[in-house]
Interface confidence: low
């Protein structure tokens, strides 16, 4: 991969349908402990290692060339819980138009095995520059993986790698409104391998979700559901062992 990842490119909204402009913390990372390609708990876990590895300090090689990673991130080894109080961020009520998610993350499930299907609450919904990171391992002989970003009973963004659809591997994206699925968007590039670890990163942009797998840009999916702040849950399901699921702001 080229060494041209920058925050500016990731957020500039260029018309490139297959942009390589992920933030510095996304791309071209050396493999870290635990065998996650690209980095060991990068992105949403600045300064924090996988369970049992490098306690209290950053894993080796994380964030080369990405100074500061995520400003305002917690000190090494610290895993803050989400703010108390009802509803969204900040805890005084629903998020304001600006600063709804100050970059103080990550929030989400602590690192460690998680039960699948798993629901990651997104208490204030999603907002542009929000980065969701999911780490796990595909089970042997896997059939499917699914991420469902949900607004009430609607599925705003369904990301569904299928390992054997008519003897082909394909990623299907869609939206479900009023129990009706819309037009499918299909992607034949398939970066998942049965039995192997993976990292999925979803970057929320004003007009679309941008998805990278193992530090390589995969696809983008235009928003079909308005009111992003009400997409308040991420469902993770399928044939995976889930290690962690979290989000932060970049």
């Amino acid at each position: 991969m080229a060494d041209n990842f920058s925050l500016h490119d990731a957020l500039s909204g260029s018309g490139n349908p297959n942009p390589q402009g992920w933030p510095g913390a996304w791309g071209n990372q050396p493999a870290g402990a635990g065998g996650y390609p690209g980095a060991s708990y990068p992105g949403a876990y600045p300064g924090q290692a996988p369970p049992g590895a490098y306690p209290g300090q950053a894993p080796p090689g994380a964030y080369p060339g990405a100074p500061g990673a995520y400003p305002g991130a917690p000190a090494p080894g610290v895993y803050p819980g989400p703010p108390s109080g009802p509803g969204a961020y900040p805890s005084s009520g629903q998020p304001s138009a600006t600063g709804a998610y100050p970059a103080t993350g990550p929030y989400g499930a602590p690192a460690g095995p998680l039960i699948v299907p798993y629901n990651l609450p997104l208490p204030g919904g999603v907002v542009p520059r929000m980065l969701i990171t999911i780490l796990g391992t595909v089970k042997p002989n896997a059939n499917r993986i699914a991420l469902d970003f949900q607004r009430g009973n609607d599925v705003a963004f369904h990301f569904n790698p299928r390992f054997n659809e008519n003897n082909r591997r394909v990623i299907v994206c869609n939206t479900k409104l009023d129990n009706n699925w819309g037009r499918e968007e299909r992607q034949s590039v398939f970066p998942f391998e049965s039995g192997k670890p993976f990292k999925i990163q979803v970057l929320v942009e004003p007009d679309h979700f941008k998805v990278a797998v193992n530090d390589a840009h995969l696809l983008q999916y235009n928003h079909r559901v308005k009111k992003l702040n009400e997409i308040s849950k991420l469902g993770i399901s399928g044939d995976i062992d889930l290690t962690s699921a979290s989000y932060t702001m970049i």
Epitope: A97, P128, G152, N153, N179, R224, S232
Partner: antibody
């Protein structure tokens, strides 16, 4: 097709409370947010807030917190707005609106008059 | 709270193209504001025209279109009809609340 039918006009005394209903037909009631909007002559349209019957989620305009409360009865596909401590400032037409990806479906409105 | 501003009144002729705009006091209107356009006709009859900046509602004539023009949301009626005479409200979404504009009274003479 999608239809929203609100309850009839209300004449209330200051200090009283009122509950306005909005019956939905033609779609899955629990899946869509219901917005509530207030219209007063000379004041245009004001968003009171919204309510998702499926899980009880709600958002309120700060101005109407303590004044309005949203509820629903999913067995009858009916949404409600409960207005308390009524004053003449609450005299208005109140609308329920089904929020959708590409459009809003508006009910016919309920006229509330608060007068002693 | 943000203030949303519309032209108070516009006049057009049948067959002409007219554009109504919607400005936000907080800066440029973006797709994240999910601009909605609603038509009000006499007797409190409201019809949703456009949602999510540029998505035309089912059954709404193709002459109605939504867009962003410069730093504002816009509703364009291409080939106005006499039945388009109405008040048009825009509404902008601000992270967790909706704000309506004051409405534009469109006269089609």
């Amino acid at each position: 097709q999608v239809q929203l039918q609100q309850s009839g006009a209300e004449l209330m005394k200051p200090g009283a409370s009122v509950k306005i209903s909005c019956k939905a037909t033609g779609y899955t009631f629990t899946n869509y947010w219901i917005e509530w909007v207030k219209q007063r002559p000379g004041h245009g349209l004001e968003w009171i807030g919204e309510f998702l019957p499926g899980d009880g989620s709600s958002h309120y305009n700060e101005k109407f917190k303590g004044k309005a409360t949203f509820t629903s009865d999913t067995s009858s596909n009916t949404a409600y707005i409960h207005l308390t401590s009524l004053t003449s400032e609450d005299s208005a037409v109140y609308y329920c609106v089904r929020d959708d990806y590409d459009s809003d479906y508006w009910a016919q409105g309920t006229t509330l008059t608060v007068s002693s | 709270q943000a203030v949303v501003t519309q032209e108070s009144a516009l006049t057009t002729s049948p067959g002409e193209t007219v554009t109504l705009t919607c400005r936000s006091s907080t800066g440029a209107v973006t797709t994240s504001n999910y601009a909605n356009w609603v038509q009000e006709k006499p007797d409190h009859l409201f019809t949703g025209l456009i949602g999510g900046t540029n998505n035309r509602a089912p059954g709404v004539p193709a002459r109605f279109s939504g867009s962003l023009i410069g730093d504002k949301a816009a509703l364009t009626i291409t080939g106005a009809q006499t039945e388009d005479e109405a008040i048009y409200f825009c509404a902008l979404w601000y992270s967790n609340h909706l704000v309506f504009g004051g409405g534009t009274k469109l006269t089609v003479l």
